[in-house]
Each structure stands twice: as C-alpha cells, then as structure tokens.
C-alpha cells in the first residue's frame, strides 16, 4: 500500500538524525536554488568480508563461520510512499536501511523514473554505527520545487557487487495549471468557422478550461482540459486567449491575434531601372500582404499617346523577385505602367501609375532605290539612294553605313563607310580591277543601325574597259542585280 | 470624347446607405482606374479611393475605410461607390474621376445631403 | 501621408499681369525623372478641370498662359497675363503614392 503524506504531515524523531521513512518538509528556504541533476554516492568503509551474489531486492548474507546463524536480509525499510506539495515549497525525503557490519563498500546511489541522478544534487547520506549494523540513513533535498521535480525517486546501494533497490517515493508537485498547448495566432477567411485549441495540465487534477475574445469570456461553463472552441466566423480581427482553472487557481494563455485575410494593399515605389528601344525594366515594393501570402502580380502597361488607341497590355507574374522586364514595346513611346498583387482573397489596387519612355530605336526600313556606278576616269565608284520612310519611333537620323565588298579570283573583301545624315550620295574608291563590288546601306540612328538594302553589284573591269551604265536595286521582289558588262 | 455621367441629387436620412453610379463612355473603361473624391461645401478636394476595373482591386484613403466601397460593373461601363451610415458629415458633392496621372476627366458630381 | 501645403489661400491680380500659386510637398513625388504633381482649376457649381500635369505639362484645350513648374518639393502655378475667365479656385494635387492628396486650395481674384 501507498503511504501519502501531504506537505502539513509532522516527522516523528525515533533515533538522531532524519528518521527512516519520515517526510520532512522544510519551509525555512524558499528561496529558488538552482536544481542540478546528480548525486555524489557515499561510501561506507567496514570490515573486509567478501559478499554473496546478488539475489534480487534483498541480499541474503552467507553464514559467518560454520555451523554459525544466518544473517536477516538486508532491505531497505519503508518510508513514505507519496509527498504531495506545492511548487516552490522545499521538500526533504530519504530511505534508511542497517548493514551488518561484516560489509564493506557499500554505495547508495538515488535515481528518479529509472535514471540516476548524477551530479551536484543536495544529497546527504549519515552513518549511525553500532556493535553489529551500521544504520545508514540517505537523505534528499529539493529546495523550491518545480514540475520537473515530479517522479518516482528511489534508492540503490550496492554491497560487494550485489544491489538492493528501495520502494518507489512518488514525489507530486502541485501548483497554477501549467500549458501544454496554447491558441496559436491565425489569418483566417472573413465569416469562416476556426478552431482554437487549449490543453493545460496539474497537478492538481481537473484543469477547466473559460475561453476569452477580446476581454470578454466566451463560455458560461467550463470545459475540461484539452479544449476545442470552434469560432463561427469573424468580421473584424480578435483577440483570444484562454484560462486554465484547477485547485491552486488559475493561469491565462498569452492573448492569440486572429487576422482577417483581406486583399493586399498594392504595391509601392514602382521604379524604372532600364529602359531600351524595346523593353523597361521595373521594380516595386510589395505593399501589405492582408494576412494571407501573394500569389502572382499583374504589370499593366499603357502607351501614352492621344493617337494611340491601344488597350492595357497585361503581364502576369510571380510574385517574387519584385522586379519584371516588360518587353514588345515600341521604342521611343510613353508608356503608363502600374503594378498589381494578389493573394488569395483577391486583387491588390493598381499602384499609382508612373511613366516611362523607351528610348529611340534602330531603323527599321533599309535606304531606297540604291544605285550604283563606275566612274572609271576618277577611279571610283559612285552611289546613290533614297532617305528611307523611317518611323518616328526609330529617332532621328544620323548617319548611314555603306557595305562594300570587292570580290575577285579567290579574294573577297569587306569595307564599310560611315556618312552623315544629310547625305544621299556616296563615292568609295576602286579597291580591285577585274572584280565585283557589291554595295548595301543601312540607315543609322542613335537606336542602332538599321537593315541593310539588298545588295547591287556592279563589275569593275580591268584598266580600259569603260561603261557607265549604273547598277541599281530592283524593284521589291526581284533577285539581286548584277550588272554584266 | 470621354464623358462620366453621375446621377442626380440624393436626400437620405441618418444611418442609411446610398449608391451612386457614375456611367462612362467615350474609352476603354477597364483601361483607366476610377477614383472618387469628395468635396464638402465650401472645402478643399478629398481623395476617396480608386478602383482598377480590369482585376478590381480596390484602395481607400484611411478616413474613409469602413465608409465607402468601390464596385464597378464591366458590362454596362459603370463604376459605384456605396457610402453607408451616413450623419451630416457625409454631407457633400462625391465625383467620379478617369484616374491616370492627374484627373483629366471629371463626372460632374452627386451631391448628398443627409438630413432628418 | 503627403501634406501639400498650397499659398496663398486667396490672391487678388489685376487683368493682364501674372498671378503666382504655390503647393509645397512634405515630401518629394518625384521618381524616375518625372514629378506627379498636378494642377487643377474650379469654378463654382463645376467639377475640377485639369490644366496641368506631371508638373510642368500642359493638358489638351488649356491655354498657354497657364504653365507649371517645379524646384525641389515647390511647384509653381503660373498665369500670364491673365484674364477674366481665370478667376476660380485653383488646386494642387499628387499622385506619387496612396493616398493621393489634394492642396488646400487658392481662390484667385481679377481685379
């Protein structure tokens, strides 16, 4: 049977010393000192006599001589079963047993819930000797106790290599309900049931459960540990905590923010950082995210011309990195951009729209009706073309590159000239007699260059061979012209 | 030409709620926020919100979170601010205005007057 | 938020001469070279009418007279030379973040 002993219980002295199987509580100290989790063994040093095996909870003696009385098994005597006490109270137990003196050695060791206890604990073992036994009494002392002080504490001792194990003490801490589980902030759905969860724990047993938003308790009766409160929706962010009632009072849970996914506010700082002929790199800052993670944004681009007519060119994204290229753009236009989050309840608003410009783009339309001719008495060849029809997107003109390339028996080579934008004719030396000269132009703006007419050749023949007749592009979709002379 | 039509005049009691349209034409209407402001009599311009009707998401000046909510219908080109528990604070003339950098073109307002 | 804070509250401008409105910025709302920063003119009984745009652009059908500029957070509201038609109440606004503000408003006089 379990002695339980309760922290009002009174030792009762039978020899000097902390009495076997007493509970001693002292209440002097209540002061906290710091717990360890060891015990320094005692050793108990007495004639030399060999031992026997050991045989379980109990060491039998072997005789003493021939003939001689056996010896009473050594065991450990009883003590109180269970102490019962509140957190923070000092607590004193210990277990005792007499040795007969024929035994050296001895070492008594206390263990809690199979582990032994190691180190720095305050654990005090006396030596009370007598003719024939020694009365060996091990004390142990808990100063401030704490849950973690609960458990089944017991003595061993061990007698040349044989143990003997004490009954079980069972040390009970009682104090304010302690949390095992609390309510854990959520971002829910508007009008969306939820549960909440709270379990707390003694001893002492029962803990009930009250459940409080936002100051004001939520349940009439309480509900025993754990505890589910299903809430049937909100409209407007809460505040919920719980409280965990036993016998020594109560304890609150910290207060659990529940947050009502909304739609994210829209992003900021929409800022440019590249612009080209064609494409605008853009970054934000994501604005508040309404409780619930973004999803993708949405780029919405519009040009910004009184004649343009388009509609908003719409481009999807990931929601991270912060940063997209827009790209098809035409090159020298305004462009109004704005950027949009969403998340799971819906759409940011679009941020507030800025604008960017595209720079100046490269020709896209190559210079007309090139023609080209010998003028042999200068030694060179003459070349003529149209102004292209560029579009004001491209930028101004500045320039135009001539191509040629001079071809004759097993050379070829490429020469290319830079002209002004006021420019429509062109002179370029003979490189090779006896060869073909193939020419091509392309318009230049500060966008690039543009492409390149399609190619005329004209045939420069060796010294003496005269003719004027020009070399000239072909009307759109014939072949490439070659003159023959 | 860009127009914003707006209704006529409203008289509403304490508490209660009114919708007001403002109908465009003459655009792309999913292609332009639509912002409203308001103005007390005799006071400066207040900004209200914005609503982009291509995603309709929605934004609100703080002051009148709670007070006003933004819808627009796509079909018939027509944007709404609803403005509900009205007190004479409410009391004013609310525009509807094509949002891009600045507010080029204006419904020519709805006036509220809550009274008992 | 922004505050723009727009001076003078009332201005009286003989016909002809120059009338001078200003809207200072808490804060810049200029990015990526451009300032969203807009002027806006209301007659009594009419909605606002939109006469300048991103600080110093001239909006479609206003006269040339009417110019804006800008020098730091300041921003300027010129008209030169002005006329009878020009008195109204004229506002500043931005459009650089939410929410969008507006000045408090200039009520120009002709005399």
């Known amino acids: 049977a379990i002695t339980e002993a309760r922290e009002e219980a009174k030792p009762y002295p039978l020899f000097p010393g902390p009495l076997p199987g007493s509970l001693q509580t002292d209440h002097t100290s209540l002061l906290s000192l710091p717990h360890t989790s060891g015990y320094q063994p005692a050793l108990m040093f007495s004639p030399t006599q060999p031992g026997r095996p050991y045989t379980g909870n109990v060491a039998i003696p072997r005789v003493t001589s021939a003939g001689s009385k056996l010896l009473p098994p050594l065991a450990f005597k009883h003590t109180v079963g269970h102490i019962i006490l509140s957190e923070h109270k000092d607590v004193k137990f210990n277990c005792s047993i007499s040795v007969p003196n024929i035994y050296q050695d001895t070492t008594i060791s206390w263990w809690k819930d199979g582990k032994e206890l190691l180190g720095a604990h305050h654990a005090i073992t006396q030596f009370y000797p007598d003719d024939e036994v020694t009365a060996i009494i091990a004390s142990f002392s808990i100063t401030s106790v704490q849950r973690s002080d609960n458990g089944s504490y017991i003595c061993k001792m061990k007698i040349n290599n044989e143990e003997i194990v004490s009954d079980p003490i069972y040390i009970e801490v009682q104090g304010l309900p302690h949390f095992t589980k609390q309510p854990e902030s959520m971002n829910v759905t508007r009008n969306t049931a939820f549960n909440l969860t709270c379990q707390a724990v003694g001893p002492p047993e029962p803990v009930n459960i009250f459940w409080v938003q936002n100051s004001s308790r939520v349940n009439e009766q309480p509900e025993k540990s754990p505890s589910v409160l299903t809430v049937p929706g909100l409209t407007e962010m809460a505040v919920f905590s719980c409280e965990a009632h036993n016998d020594k009072g109560l304890t609150v849970s910290k207060g659990v923010q529940i947050n009502i996914k909304a739609i994210p506010s829209p992003p900021t700082e929409v800022s440019i950082h590249n612009s080209t002929a064609h494409s605008i790199l853009i970054s934000w800052v994501p604005g508040f995210d309404g409780y619930s993670p973004f999803r993708n944004c949405s780029v919405q681009v519009k040009e910004v011309d009184p004649l343009s007519n388009g509609s908003v060119m719409i481009f999807n994204t990931s929601a991270s990195p912060h940063m997209y290229q827009i790209k098809q753009l035409q090159a020298l236009a305004n462009y109004s951009i704005g950027v949009s989050c969403m998340n799971e309840i819906g759409w940011s608003a679009v941020s507030p729209w800025i604008l960017a410009s595209t720079t100046e783009g490269a020709p896209s339309v190559a210079p007309l009706n090139v023609t080209v001719f010998l003028n042999e008495s200068r030694d060179n060849v003459d070349i003529r073309w149209m102004k292209p029809l560029t579009k004001r997107q491209a930028g101004e003109l500045v320039g135009y590159r001539i191509s040629h390339v001079w071809q004759s028996a097993g050379i070829s080579k490429e020469l290319l000239e830079e002209v002004g934008q006021n420019n429509s004719r062109a002179q370029i030396s003979v490189q090779v007699h006896n060869a073909t000269c193939t020419v091509r132009i392309a318009a230049v703006t500060k966008g690039g260059v543009g492409p390149f007419s399609d190619p005329v050749k004209i045939f420069i023949p060796a010294h003496g061979w005269v003719d004027h007749a020009p070399s000239s592009t072909p009307a759109p979709g014939n072949a490439d012209p070659v003159l023959i002379i | 030409e860009v127009q914003l039509q707006q209704s006529g005049p409203e008289l509403v009691k304490p508490g209660a709620s009114v919708r007001i349209p403002c109908k465009a034409s003459?655009?792309?209407?999913?292609?332009?926020?639509m912002d409203w402001v308001k103005q007390s009599h005799g006071k400066s311009l207040e900004w209200i919100g914005n609503?982009?009707?291509?995603?309709?998401?929605?934004i609100y000046s703080q002051k009148f979170k709670g007070k006003a909510t933004l819808t627009v219908d796509k079909s018939s080109s027509t944007a709404y601010m609803e403005l509900r528990s009205l007190t004479s604070e409410d009391t004013a003339v609310y525009y509807c205005?094509?949002?891009?950098?600045?507010?080029?073109?204006w419904g020519q307002g709805t006036l509220v007057t809550v009274s008992a | 938020d922004i505050v723009l804070t727009q001076s003078p509250a009332s201005l009286t401008v003989s016909l002809g001469q120059r009338a001078t409105i200003s809207c200072r910025a808490s804060r810049s709302v200029s990015t990526s070279g451009y300032s969203y920063m807009h002027w806006y003119q209301q007659k009594p009984g009419q909605p606002p009418k939109l006469l300048i745009y991103l600080a110093s652009n001239l909006e479609s059908g206003v006269p040339a007279r009417f110019s804006g500029s800008r020098s730091g957070t300041d921003f300027t509201l010129n008209i030169h030379p002005v006329e009878e038609e020009d008195a109204a109440t004229y506002y500043c606004?931005?459009?650089?973040?939410?929410?969008?503000?507006f000045g408090s408003g200039t009520k120009l006089e002709i005399k």
């Open positions: 003459g655009y792309t209407f999913s292609d332009y926020n």
């Open positions: 205005a094509r949002g891009d950098y600045g507010f080029a073109s």
């Open positions: 609503i982009n009707p291509n995603i309709g998401g929605t």
């Open positions: 606004q931005h459009s650089r973040e939410y929410p969008f503000t």
